[in-house]
Interface confidence: low
């Protein structure tokens, strides 16, 4: 079991709440399943508190992962017959230690409540409960304490009093001939597996069975209503008698079913198929799953098993649910294959832990000064002038697309291309017609520019050529991405598909031009444009391209 911060719920601090060392306790409370869950109702079936609790120390600034929890079981002795249906309440309490703890010494961190169905002697059931920012992983099972046996722990079996026969007044206990049970006082014919009695001539049925002698299985359809029956009424079908019925594990071992048979998890000091062997030493090989045995040279000294990764328990007999730590990133599905963890990644992610985002620019190199561009769930290279192809590795002629308007001549240039305009035209792409009188230069309404006061487009008549990036209203947006963490710089990339922000500082060459920005009348002041995405903090810069001037020939 483990207790730690739940996924996607922020990162709660360690349980000690920055107030020095602390301990966690778990209080387990069992209530009858038939009663409505009420906070004040008693733990009528039993309650217990965890023991041998480790002390946690607060490390400033350190977030809590799953916490190492008390080793061993929380045992809740229940009273009377096991009802099969019950309410399970688990409370996580923090005890603050140390002189300067301040505030209350005890705090309830989390409380989970759930109604459960469970047959005694069955295998471990696993569960995960989330409450607030915490997540509790736990397993639970019900088993009978000798001399009780059966799915309700209502039949009594005594240890055999003689090698060959049962003691006076006792008869062999049906599932296990090595044990003896008190003679039945139930109604004659009452099913020994599915019925029990507390009074003479009575036959009370376990859940899943009905009829005067508890021999008729209940249809599972009665489970469809939410009624939770008592032991004697009809109810939902529980597993029938299984290999763990009566608990074949001796000396406090716990039984779990494995493909029609059973396995005993033995407490320290006991070993064997049914935990029947005691006085175990390391020579007996008590550590399962490759555990390393230390100590225990002679039967009187205890051995300790040091378990390999993935296993726990006094004999390394329990597999750790390594997937509960959610090692697979980006929504990957975790599979604990025994020898290794494997992650099955969602589309668009890859890597042993699905840590690589195939659709981002992190692993993409664009050659020859190209820039990686994300958008629409894919990525591409935006190549520098003069280069093309998927990775900008192919040479491209910047003049091939005939970018110069009105008969202008295109010249390849170290920083891109230059248009030499025909007489009567000027501009980056020769898009401006120059009036014959030389008074005004009227643009051929480039896209992105609002038709405004013609005086704003006055250009000196001596300039035959003006090259300035952004004349069409698209200043170059360079977005600098910083992932959380010191100095981790993923470099520069352009994001496509994002709405261009308004720019409040424009290149000098563009100061007299208005950018089209919705219905706005001019550049709005939004230098603080910074929308974090996926935990990135992004700074935006507007880079004016160099202006190139050339004289008319």
């Amino acid at each position: 079991h483990s207790f730690g911060p739940g996924p996607g719920l922020g990162t709660p601090r360690s349980p000690c709440n920055a107030r020095g060392p602390c301990r966690l306790f778990f209080r387990v409370c069992l209530k009858p399943g038939v009663s409505q869950e009420a906070t004040e109702s008693l733990c009528a079936l039993g309650a217990a508190l965890s023991t041998s609790v480790p002390v946690y120390t607060e490390h400033p600034g350190e977030s809590a992962a799953a916490l190492p929890l008390p080793d061993g079981l929380v045992r809740v002795p229940f009273r009377d017959a096991w009802p099969g249906t019950f309410s399970l309440v688990i409370e996580t309490w923090r005890e603050q230690l140390g002189e300067h703890a301040g505030g209350p010494a005890w705090n309830l961190l989390a409380r989970v409540v759930g109604r459960r169905r469970l047959a005694a002697g069955g295998p471990w059931a696993r569960d995960v409960q989330r409450t607030g920012t915490w997540e509790l992983h736990f397993s639970y099972r019900a088993r009978c304490e000798p001399p009780a046996v059966g799915a309700a722990c209502a039949r009594l079996c005594r240890s055999r009093s003689a090698p060959s026969r049962c003691g006076p007044g006792l008869r062999p206990c049906t599932p296990f001939p090595d044990e003896c049970e008190a003679p039945s006082v139930c109604r004659p014919g009452c099913s020994p597996e599915h019925g029990y009695c507390e009074e003479p001539d009575e036959c009370r049925c376990l859940e899943g069975w009905t009829g005067p002698l508890c021999t008729v299985p209940v249809s599972t359809s009665s489970c469809l209503n939410s009624r939770v029956p008592g032991p004697a009424s009809t109810g939902c079908l529980l597993p029938g008698p299984g290999p763990c019925d009566g608990n074949p594990c001796a000396n406090g071992g716990s039984c779990s079913e494995t493909s029609g048979s059973f396995e005993c998890a033995c407490p320290r000091g006991f070993y064997g198929l049914r935990c029947e062997v005691s006085g175990v030493t390391c020579a007996d090989g008590p550590c399962f799953n490759g555990g390393l045995c230390v100590g225990g040279e002679d039967p009187d000294s205890a051995y300790v098993c040091h378990c390999p990764p993935g296993f726990q328990g006094s004999n390394c007999e329990k597999r750790v649910d390594r997937c509960s730590l959610q090692p697979c990133q980006n929504g990957g599905l975790c599979l604990d294959l025994g020898h290794a963890l494997r992650c099955r990644c969602r589309a668009g992610f890859a890597g042993p832990r699905c840590e690589h985002d195939l659709d981002d620019c992190a692993g993409r190199a664009c050659a020859n000064g190209g820039t990686c561009v994300e958008g629409g769930g894919s990525r591409r290279c935006s190549c520098a002038l003069g280069f093309g192809g998927r990775d900008c590795r192919e040479r491209a002629d910047p003049c091939a697309s005939r970018p110069c308007a009105h008969g202008g001549r295109c010249y390849a240039h170290f920083s891109g291309l230059v248009c030499a305009c025909a007489p009567g035209y000027m501009g980056v792409r020769c898009e401006f017609a120059v009036r014959p009188d030389g008074a005004d230069a009227v643009p051929a309404a480039p896209r992105g520019l609002r038709q405004a006061d013609p005086q704003r487009f006055l250009l000196p008549p001596a300039l035959g050529l003006l090259v300035a990036a952004g004349l069409a209203g698209a200043a170059l947006l360079v977005i600098h991405v910083r992932r959380r963490g010191p100095g981790q710089d993923t470099g520069t990339r352009l994001l496509s598909g994002t709405r261009e922000p308004s720019v409040h500082t424009l290149p000098d060459a563009l100061n007299n031009l208005r950018l089209q920005d919705g219905a706005g009348d001019g550049p709005s002041s939004s230098a603080d444009w910074n929308h974090p995405e996926d935990g990135d903090s992004r700074s935006i810069y507007v880079i004016p391209a160099p202006s190139i001037y050339a004289r008319e020939a």
């Epitope: 599905l333 294959l337 494997r342 990644c345 992610f349 890859a350 890597g351 195939l358």
Partner: antibody, heavy 118, light 107 residues
């Protein structure tokens, strides 16, 4: 020893469905995932999907999504692959293969030949 | 999907020859590549996992190498029982994909 035993050969008509079973023995069934792979005559192996035998969660290859259903019965230690809307190009040998601890498929079933013919 | 391109598609070599089969991934697959041997009419058998780890029981003449996008299966001394088709497979990213296979014959 680890064994994967598949159901016998099937002959189906186009548009029908086929369900192939794969019974595992010699290991704890729920500790290892199960792959389904097919091989058309003279073609490369083609991964169809896999099932997490512990949780029952299947994952399918895009090429088969909507047509394939992978399930399991833990009490019988058996995995199943059902392919619907069969067409002639689905004629192939279908394999189940256990997902090993460090490898995509360490033990393979003997294969089930499915022939789709009108 | 990640494409696995295997070459050659077939080869013929003499007993004792060193045989090399290559597999190229369309993008990096780290070292998550396995190699399988399939004899005529039989099921595939795992030879190599994690690009270079020989599976238990596989003869030492089989070895694997590579990481990222380029992987190689080498048979150091070809034996008659090695006549089979060899496949590479990536399990780095779903869907897992196989190479087209290399058919190895004895001259």
């Amino acid at each position: 020893q680890v064994q994967l035993v598949q159901s016998g050969a099937e002959v189906k008509k186009p548009g029908a469905s086929v369900k192939v079973s794969c019974k595992a023995s010699g290991y704890t069934f729920t500790n290892y995932g199960m792959n389904w792979v097919r091989q058309a005559p003279g073609q490369r192996l083609e991964w169809m999907g896999w099932i997490n035998t512990y949780t029952g969660d299947p994952t399918y290859a895009d090429d088969f999504k909507g047509r394939v259903t992978i399930t399991r019965d833990t009490s019988a230690s058996t995995a199943y692959m059902e392919l619907s809307s069969l067409r002639s190009e689905d004629t192939a040998v279908y394999y189940c293969a256990r997902i090993g601890g460090n490898s995509p498929s360490d033990y393979w079933g003997q294969g089930t030949t499915v022939t789709v013919s009108s | 999907d990640i494409q696995m391109t295997q070459s050659p598609s077939s080869l013929s070599a003499s007993v004792g020859d060193r045989v090399t089969i290559t597999c190229k991934a369309s993008q990096s697959v780290s070292n998550d590549v396995a190699w399988y041997q399939q004899k005529p009419g039989k099921v595939p058998k795992l030879l190599i996992y994690y690009a270079s780890n020989r599976y238990s029981g596989v003869p030492s003449r089989f070895s694997g190498s590579g990481s990222g996008t380029d992987f190689t299966l080498t048979i150091s001394s070809l034996q008659p029982e090695d006549v089979a088709t060899y496949f590479c497979q990536q399990d780095y990213s779903s869907p897992w994909t196989f190479g087209g296979g290399t058919k190895v014959e004895i001259k």
